[in-house]
Interface confidence: low
């Protein structure tokens, strides 16, 4: 594992002005077709903002509204997906913030419909008419090779019939495919004969076989999934995690951080702390304290969750999940708000740290 040189009360040395967004993978905003999407340009002191999509200047039109630091896309379509950037032009310099827009109905297995037509896949059989499993819609199975960008959703379908109604199970690379085999698990929609994997990562590459069987026979079909990934990248942190939390004094709270990385990531939980009554050092950078880091005896699952038990007012503040690999660092932050316990609002707790 690559190790960080971050220790207690060290600083992250951000550039001027400090922002978290330059050093992490771009945020991903997901919308379903037809939905509206609003994104705020996360840059400070933005006097003049210009927008681009996939490197091309983006101007207002009947579906795209640009107001100040906000971009609105009305009635999104898959064509709106891409890499967006807002650039803040200042008198002496300019700064750019990148983000991804993904307009998808979360379908990848050759069917673009909403799957509201499940009846087509459920063929009713006369109970006397015993029949071995058979495919009911081979058109949806023609595309065997699926090359999907990382972080997208993949759906494989094996619509089948038979009497009695066959069961379906899935194999990965010829072996039983278990939920614990991938971060976030997977979904099986039996009524649609489908396997769904969200936020695919390179380790999801491989052959996926549906096995459909009843007492009269068994059929199978194999798809190959290739997760299209650019060259080695910093860890990708799941958008929206960790999430802001609030609890009362004495309560418990947990922050969750989901990390995706080709190279082995090193994960740390950091709290923004005060030193000598100040949150910032003389250089203007924040004081940080490492609360939890991956060690020899720590599993990935354990490090992805930060538990804070018996919360006190001193626990309030900003918490950061920081993940790094051999290529770089990414981090997301969340705030913990601590509320007075009911009926104890007037009680004042003094922390020994602040007593003279």
């Amino acid at each position: 594992r690559p190790s960080f040189s971050l220790v207690e009360d060290t600083t992250l040395e951000p550039e001027e002005p400090p922002t978290k967004y330059q050093i992490s993978q771009p945020e991903v905003y997901v919308a379903a077709p037809g939905e509206s999407l609003e994104v705020r340009c996360l840059l400070k002191d933005a006097a003049v903002i210009s927008w681009t999509k996939d490197g091309v200047h983006l101007g207002p039109n009947n579906r795209t509204v640009l107001i100040g630091e906000y971009l609105q896309i009305k009635g999104a379509t898959p064509r709106d997906s891409g890499l967006y950037a807002c650039t803040a032009s200042r008198t002496v310099d300019s700064e750019t913030w990148y983000f991804m827009v993904n307009v998808t109905d979360a379908i990848s297995s050759g069917d673009d419909e909403d799957d509201t037509d499940g009846a087509e896949d459920f063929v009713s059989e006369n109970s006397n008419n015993k029949r071995a499993p058979y495919w009911t819609n081979t058109e949806k199975m023609e595309k065997r090779l699926h090359a999907v960008p990382a972080a997208n959703t993949v759906k494989f379908r094996c619509p089948a019939g038979g009497n009695p109604m066959p069961t379906m199970r899935w194999l990965k690379n010829g072996k039983e495919f278990k939920q614990e085999h991938r971060i976030g698990g997977y979904k099986v929609r039996n009524q649609h004969w489908s396997l769904i994997m969200e936020s695919v990562v390179p380790s999801d590459k491989g052959n996926y076989t549906c096995v459909v069987e009843n007492e009269y026979g068994s059929i199978n079909h194999t798809y190959h999934l290739d997760v299209v990934e650019r060259s080695p990248h910093r860890p990708i942190l799941q958008a929206g995690l960790p999430a802001n939390a609030s609890t009362v004094v004495g309560g418990d709270v947990e922050f969750v951080c989901k990390v995706y990385s080709d190279a082995q990531p090193h994960i740390q939980w950091i709290k923004h702390v005060e030193k000598n009554g100040s949150k910032y050092g003389p250089d203007g950078l924040p004081y940080l304290k490492v609360l939890k880091a991956a060690g020899v005896n720590t599993t990935d699952k354990e490090i992805e969750v930060l538990y804070i038990r018996n919360v006190t007012f001193e626990d309030a503040g900003e918490y950061t999940c920081l993940a790094g690999n051999s290529i770089g660092i990414s981090f997301h932050s969340a705030w913990l708000t601590v509320l007075p316990a009911p009926g104890r609002e007037k009680e004042i707790t003094a922390s020994p740290d602040y007593l003279e």
Partner: antibody, heavy 118, light 111 residues
Framework: EVQLLESGGGLVQPGGSLRLSCAAS????????MHWVRQAPGKGLEWVAV????????YYADSVKGRFTISRDNSKNTLYLQMNSLRAEDTAVYYC???????????WGQGTLVTVSS | QSVLTQPPSASGTPGQRVTISCSGS????????VNWYQQLPGTAPKLLIY???NRPSGVPDRFSGSKSGTSASLAISGLRSEDEADYYC???????????FGGGTKLTVLG
Amino acid sequence: EVQLLESGGGLVQPGGSLRLSCAASGFTFSHSGMHWVRQAPGKGLEWVAVISYDGSNKYYADSVKGRFTISRDNSKNTLYLQMNSLRAEDTAVYYCAREAPLYDFEYWGQGTLVTVSS
Amino acid sequence: QSVLTQPPSASGTPGQRVTISCSGSSSNIGDNGVNWYQQLPGTAPKLLIYGASNRPSGVPDRFSGSKSGTSASLAISGLRSEDEADYYCAAWDDSLDGWVFGGGTKLTVLG
């Protein structure tokens, strides 16, 4: 504005040593993977080495393994390439390049010329 | 001998469309993104295309990239005299644990 400024190039005899530096500014150096890429006169580009943001991971091209060492000093925003046992075929312009979150080798310095000759 | 193979030269007249190919293997282009760089005479290389087909901000849309299997290509439409330069493809190679470049293609704009 991102700036990368290489220095330390010059004439050295075969078997000699040289240390190149790359001074970085205009971005968060301590968060960026950094590369050295070289170009022999009239030839194409050849990747030399990469170092992770914190210096913990390093990769080298086979042609320089065991002879070159990439390092960095994040407190000085400086990248280094220590070149030992230099050969004539190491003669090239050496560029340092920054890897940005979305791109690889997004920013390049202007290069420093290393000449290995007796 | 470069790991990625490019034609040494290409040419076209102003306004024409020119395509430069880059051939590799499954361990580099096949499994990873491919980038394209433009190097004008006497200057440092400049990123032109990343991830096979994406253009950084500021790169004209006359430049486009594509990838199929273990090969990639760079297309330049509406050729201009200022496009005369050396063009390099590059990709991470899983088996070498490092970056590999093509040998470069010298583009000449005729007339």
